[in-house]
């Protein structure tokens, strides 16, 4: 099963880029295009992404890139860089050589001996940098998303194929399959692979059935599987919860709308710093939990859980994960206590001593005796206990 994030990924903020870059098989991505399957070609060189040289861009490389990215084949050759010499020859002999010139720290090229990504290699400094870039538009726009899970990193799995979003059947759906989804979306690793009805059922076609990933694939559509069959209904739509998904609970209060603020992130529950816990953050949390608005921010207790989270909201966000956030930074809320909140829907405001039992609670056991409690609320959040 996927292991926790490496140490260099533990300190994270909402402003950082995704944990895994696309195109693991071929170190390539498309940027500034109308979709994830069109745009300027960039190749990865050690830690940076560089635009690929346009002069050496050909139909084989275009085809290989589109296939590697799961975008079908390449569209018309008119999308490629025009076949003309990249630059005119240099000045006549006798003039100063430009060998030591900065232009020689030129652009990399993606060179392919065939239209298959295994036949390609990135060659550094293959072209002089003159601003001409390789571009491609691929024939098939494929994409992946998680829907109705309260954020981009949890929910029902949906694939875009042939211009239509559709579900994946939960037959044989497991952590390895969910791990590929999470990694592809830049959502870390899979915390849970969920069978149907944990999220709202889909409505479109069912694109895949019997998915059987090894966990190493870069894209879900690279995993072995079958086309969606008629006997698979939307009651069997597969779901996933990824480590980068955040869900929240209030503990130690009279009911679920009062208490210490805890966020489930990267597989564990964490406390939240009260040093920056202002009315705007409390308001966003109370509303996202379906608990009305924030009434009070009581004094917190010392941090007791494994990690710490810091939020900074303007008050208009739908959930705390839409706010600016930082996690476990070494200098994070070192002097602070764990944030607490009392929301307007809490029974303690009405002098009622009986704790509220959340409506429609199911408890199910999935994968290695991990208990998942699903609260059938508007936010459809998952609470992993």
């Amino acid at each position: 099963h996927p292991s926790p994030a490496p140490p260099d990924q533990l300190n994270t903020s909402s402003a950082e880029s995704e944990l895994w870059e696309p195109g693991e098989r071929l170190p390539v991505r498309l940027t500034n295009g109308s979709s994830s399957c069109s745009g300027t070609v960039e190749v990865r060189l050690e830690a940076s992404w560089e635009p690929a040289c346009g002069a050496l861009w050909d139909s084989r490389a275009a085809e290989a890139v589109c296939r590697a990215l799961g975008c079908g084949g390449a569209e018309a050759a008119s999308q490629l860089a025009p076949p003309t010499p990249e630059l005119p020859p240099p000045p006549a002999a006798g003039n100063t050589s430009v060998a030591a010139n900065a232009t020689l720290a030129g652009a990399p090229a993606l060179l392919c001996s065939g239209a298959e990504w295994r036949l390609c290699e990135v060659v550094e400094h293959a072209c002089r940098s003159d601003g001409r870039r390789a571009r491609v538009t691929c024939a098939e726009n494929r994409a992946l998303r998680l829907v109705d899970g309260g954020g981009a990193c949890a929910g029902r799995v949906e694939m875009l194929e042939h211009g239509e979003w559709g579900s994946v059947c939960d037959d044989t759906w497991d952590l390895e399959d969910a791990h590929v989804v999470c990694r592809q979306l830049g959502c870390g690793w899979a915390v849970q692979a969920l069978p149907g009805l944990h999220f709202t059922p889909g409505r479109g076609p069912i694109h895949r059935d019997q998915v059987n990933c090894s966990g190493a694939e870069a894209y879900l559509w690279d995993c072995p599987g079958l086309p969606g069959q008629h006997y698979c209904g939307h009651k069997e739509d597969a779901g996933a919860v990824c480590s980068e998904h955040q869900s929240w609970r209030l503990t130690g209060g009279a009911d679920r709308c009062e208490g210490q603020v805890e966020v489930h992130f990267r597989g564990v529950w964490n406390t939240v710093c009260d040093s920056e816990w202002y009315p705007s953050e409390a308001k966003v949390l109370c509303q996202s939990l379906g608990c009305g608005t924030a009434v009070e921010r009581p004094k917190g207790l010392p941090h007791s859980l494994s990690g710490r989270m810091y939020y900074s909201c303007n008050g208009e966000e739908l959930t705390l994960s839409n706010c600016s956030w930082r996690f476990n930074n070494s200098n994070l809320c070192s002097q602070s206590l764990a944030a607490r909140v009392l929301c307007s829907a809490s029974r303690s405001l009405h002098n009622l001593s009986t704790p509220e039992v959340p409506a429609s609670v199911q408890t199910v056991t999935i994968e290695s005796s991990v208990t998942v409690k699903i609260e059938n609320k508007e936010s459809r959040e998952l609470m992993l206990l």
Partner: nanobody
Framework: QVQLQESGGGLVQAGGSLRLSCTAS????????LGWFRQGPGKEREFVAA????????YYADSVKGRFTISRDNAKNTLLLQMNSLKPEDTAVYFC????????????????WGKGTQVTVSS
């Protein structure tokens, strides 16, 4: 105008070796990325190997990978192609090429061609 002159071709038995050389008249030799193309009997011209301006990057056709090695000596204005484990299908006229804008992997970026040297590999 850059003049490219190939040498070192000849007749060799399968499994043997040859070393092709290309010299350039141009004093700004190091401004050019260089390479080799070849044209076998009744075949189209095809890419063999290329090297960038300073020699730090090389690229080979799949058919010669592991057998041929391209190198350059900018001080002597010379490009070399060491050909080992030659096969009958390596029989062709070998052309030295120079390109200012990019490594000469595709014909449309090539600025200058040599006249060629014949390599014949007998079985």
């Amino acid at each position: 105008q850059v003049q490219l002159q190939e040498s070192g071709g000849g007749l060799v038995q399968a499994g043997g070796s040859l070393r092709l050389s290309c010299t350039a008249s141009e004093r700004t030799f190091s401004d050019y990325a260089l390479g080799w193309f070849r044209q076998g009997p009744g075949k189209e011209r095809e890419f063999v190997a290329a090297i960038n301006w300073v020699g730090g990057s090389t690229y080979y056709a799949d058919s010669v990978k592991g057998r041929f090695t391209i190198s350059r000596d900018n001080a002597k204005n010379t490009l070399l192609l060491q050909m080992n484990s030659l096969k009958p299908e390596d029989t062709a006229v070998y052309f030295c090429v120079a390109s200012w804008g990019a490594m000469p992997v595709l014909t449309h970026v090539i600025n200058y061609w040599g006249k060629g040297t014949q390599v014949t590999v007998s079985s």
